[in-house]
């Protein structure tokens, strides 16, 4: 039979989250127990302030901090505890919208779900063993802290605070599912799920890094492509006090302070887009893998799932090369992305190219990670665009894209696909933050020659834009592959930062599908009105906001 329902254990009575909620986690010195209290307390292990402005701006804002007087493990667990505590209603609604039936009671693919559960259990067990064997390793210390944070999140949500001192278990089909949403796209294929989340050709983000004339600024922009059910959004600011290793003698990590776009119950970005206190901005677009022969590299032992490697690299790295070195260890071959690491420390405003270090590109597929410094390319062409197709020829070929080009044509090619051409045509028009926002949320598919799909009826296709609006494709159209169909999917946000904004850990951000030159998305008027979208606004007409950290 089907697996029992996982995830949120307690039914939420009041689903209307308050406008603001502030909580702290205190350590009772006598009993050694952790407890949650309202407000911010000076001796708290961790604290968080959640401001819910989803109805006003499309975003909630989470400001979370931990206290360096306590050991890293306690901080990490408490960080998870306090995040769940201030955002429990949003977590419940996001879970219901996106994951409630994943391997749940109505799941028909029991065989796949058993394989997934087994894969995750073996992988979690293998990581626990590595953590025990490598207790002094900065890498495994950070892996442990990441899993402790997730454990705190889950324990807090379920109403029990029990700080684990030794080994601890993570439920494979609990809130781990919210973290591995990206990894699942590939795990489903590697484990032979028959109906997968991934549509052939489905894009998963657009990004551009733009050097303004005279190097007067370097702008970084990202547009997440996702199912519209994922539009309960939180911009998070973490101010942690973790050390590189488990002893106090270790220095603090480089990436303790970070701001990122995220989702309820998710302790990393997932989009991905991070502004780090180390001076790095890290972001990705998904390239996936279309070569079935590579799935043999996806194994539960010897690999760390991508979401964890992402967190660890963000925490430990001070530059792009180190970030890549950390990230590529224990390649899981899941959530296969093109990562862009921008190091603002190396960028000289109004100055010449430093020759290296400003931009590092990494591409991962199963069994392969390729890295290169692309600073000179950035300064020569003035931009780096990313649109779900591998740049490196070796990755492009190994991941099976040549076959798709042969079958479907330029849509799958690196230089000739619609977004590549739109970016190339319009990137020179970016002159400031506002024009960058317009480019990264651009979709004028009815009027743009580059949005035409010759094999489609009708020819204009809303997928063929920088920010897709696949809900606007006609349901009764004729399309060569799934990505071009009508579906509740598209670009669901915009994040843009600059040299000066990144210094202040800030960004411009807009939530929801683009409506610059298109009708705004409205659940009640859409063909997808019956889909769960608890807690979401009905009408999505939000303008970009400057993220309001105090």
């Amino acid at each position: 039979g089907a697996l029992p329902t996982q995830g949120p254990g307690r039914r939420r009575q009041n689903l209307d989250p308050p406008v603001s909620r502030v909580r702290s986690v205190l350590l009772d010195a006598a009993s050694g127990q952790l407890r949650l209290v309202d407000g911010i307390h000076p001796y708290a292990v961790a604290w968080a302030n959640l401001t819910n402005a989803i109805r006003e701006t499309g975003w909630a804002y989470l400001d979370l901090g931990t206290n360096g007087s306590y050991n890293d493990s306690l901080q990490a667990y408490a960080a998870g505890v306090v995040e769940a505590s201030v955002s429990e209603e949003l977590i419940y609604m996001h879970w219901m919208n996106t994951m409630v039936n994943y391997c749940g009671p109505f799941e028909y693919e029991v065989g796949y779900c058993e394989k997934l559960k087994s894969f995750l259990e073996i992988n979690l067990e293998w990581m626990q063993r590595e953590m025990e064997l490598s207790q002094d390793s900065p890498y495994w210390h950070q892996v442990r802290l990441t899993l402790l944070q997730l454990k705190g999140l889950e324990d807090s949500y379920e109403g029990r605070l029990t700080f684990p001192t030794g080994r601890f278990t993570i439920k494979p089909l609990g809130f781990l599912l919210l973290q591995i949403a990206g990894d699942l796209e590939d795990l489903e294929q590697a484990l032979n799920k028959t109906s997968t989340k991934l549509s052939l050709g489905s894009g998963s983000c657009s990004a551009i890094i733009k050097l303004l004339p005279g190097a007067r600024d370097l702008l970084v922009a990202h547009n997440t492509w996702n199912s519209y059910q994922n539009m309960l959004r939180i911009i998070k600011k973490y101010q942690l006090q973790f050390r590189q290793g488990p002893q106090e003698a270790y220095p603090l990590i480089a990436g303790n302070n970070l701001v990122f776009s995220s989702y309820p119950g998710t302790i990393f970005s997932g989009d991905d887009f991070y502004i780090l206190g180390s001076g790095l901005v890290t972001l990705e677009t998904t390239i996936g893998n279309k070569n079935p022969a590579l799935w043999k590299y996806v194994q539960p032992q010897g690999c760390v799932l991508e979401w964890i490697r992402n967190i660890v690299a963000n925490r430990l790295a001070l530059d792009g090369a180190t970030w890549a070195d950390i990230f590529k260890q224990f390649n899981s071959g899941t959530y296969n992305n093109q990562w862009m690491i921008v190091d603002y420390k190396a960028f000289i405003p109004n100055g010449p190219s430093p020759g290296s270090r400003v931009l590092t590109i990494l591409e991962q597929i199963p069994g392969m990670v390729v890295v290169a410094d692309k600073t000179e390319d950035l300064y020569k062409t003035t931009y780096w665009a990313s649109y779900n197709i591998p740049f490196f020829e070796i990755v492009f070929n190994a991941s099976g894209l040549q076959d798709l080009v042969a079958q479907y044509g330029d849509w799958f090619s690196y230089t000739k696909n619609p977004r590549a051409q739109i970016f190339q045509r319009d990137q020179s028009l970016v002159e400031d933050m506002n024009s960058m926002v317009r480019l990264i949320r651009y979709n004028n598919f009815l009027h743009d020659p580059l949005s035409l799909c010759e094999a489609c009826i009708p020819k204009p296709n809303a997928e063929n834009a920088i920010s897709a609006r696949s809900d606007l494709n006609p349901a009764n159209g004729s399309y060569p592959f799934q990505a071009l169909y009508q579906r509740p999917h598209g670009g669901i946000d915009v994040k843009v930062t600059s040299f000066s904004l990144a210094k202040r850990m800030s960004m411009l951000a807009a939530s929801g599908p683009t409506w610059d030159q298109l009708p705004p998305f409205q659940w009640s008027l859409s063909p997808f009105r019956s889909m769960l979208h608890m807690g979401q606004p009905d009408l999505w007409t939000f303008s970009p906001i400057s993220v309001p950290w105090d």
Partner: antibody, heavy 119, light 107 residues
Framework: EVQLQESGPCLVKPSQTLSLTCSVT????????WNWIRKFPGNKLESMGY???????YYNPSLKSRISITRDTSKNQYYLQLNSVTTEDTATYYC?????????????WGQGTTLTVSS | DIVMTQSPAILSVSPGERVSFSCRAS??????IHWYQQRRNGSPRLLIK???ESISGIPSRFSGSGSGTDFILSINSVESEDIADYYC?????????FGGGTKLELK
């Protein structure tokens, strides 16, 4: 500096076809979107349609059955043809550029040509 | 089509005064609005793009504000050369449409 210059007749009889030319210098019509806009005697401005850098066209639905916009890239010119004109088509006709859909404003305009429809 | 309504039709001012032109859209258009000035016998000239963004070469006395459905163009100290017609234009959806214009005249 981008410059646009309209040319064509000042007077057309009702039911005839209006033909106007826009000559572009300082930019190529193989980039951007090249528009026709008219201003009626009561000062109302109306966007009539455009031809894109690729040659695709869009026409205001209110004119769709009567309008055609074409181009000659070798001359860097584009053209407006409006069939079956009536006195209601009396207006000043402007050609104007939109650089891209990232910049959705008319940044360069011709000086305009005034057309009277009268028998 | 999106209807753009400008008010008032005519504004009479003295030099040095601050003046504001209003433009209302029939539905929310975010900040997809642009303002033009047309002097007598001239062609329209772009003054403000995307509701509030300035244009190089346009005097700093011109400014714009608003989002959604209500927008304002302001001149903080009118000069005689500002006597002209002022138009708003939406670019949220085709066909792009203009307001009926406001005529600025000297008292």
């Amino acid at each position: 500096e981008v410059q646009l210059q309209e040319s064509g007749p000042c007077l057309v009889k009702p039911s005839q076809t209006l033909s106007l030319t826009c000559s572009v210098t300082g930019d190529s019509i193989t980039s951007g979107y090249w528009n026709w806009i008219r201003k009626f005697p009561g000062n109302k401005l109306e966007s009539m349609g455009y031809i894109s850098y690729s040659g695709s066209t869009y026409y205001n639905p209110s004119l769709k059955s009567r309008i055609s916009i074409t181009r000659d890239t070798s001359k860097n010119q584009y053209y407006l043809q409006l069939n079956s004109v009536t006195t209601e088509d009396t207006a000043t006709y402007y050609c104007a550029r939109i650089a891209s859909w990232i910049t959705t404003y008319f940044d360069y305009w011709g000086q305009g040509t005034t057309l009277t429809v009268s028998s | 089509d999106i209807v753009m309504t400008q008010s008032p039709a005519i504004l009479s001012v003295s030099p040095g005064e601050r003046v504001s032109f209003s433009c209302r859209a029939s539905q929310s258009i975010g900040t997809s609005i642009h303002w033009y000035q047309q002097r007598r016998n001239g062609s329209p000239r772009l003054l403000i793009k995307y509701a509030s963004e300035s244009i190089s070469g346009i005097p700093s006395r011109f400014s714009g504000s608003g989002s959604g459905t209500d927008f304002i163009l302001s001149i903080n100290s009118v000069e005689s050369e500002d006597i002209a017609d002022y138009y708003c234009q939406q670019s949220n959806s085709w066909p792009y449409t203009f307001g009926g214009g406001t005529k600025l005249e000297l008292k």
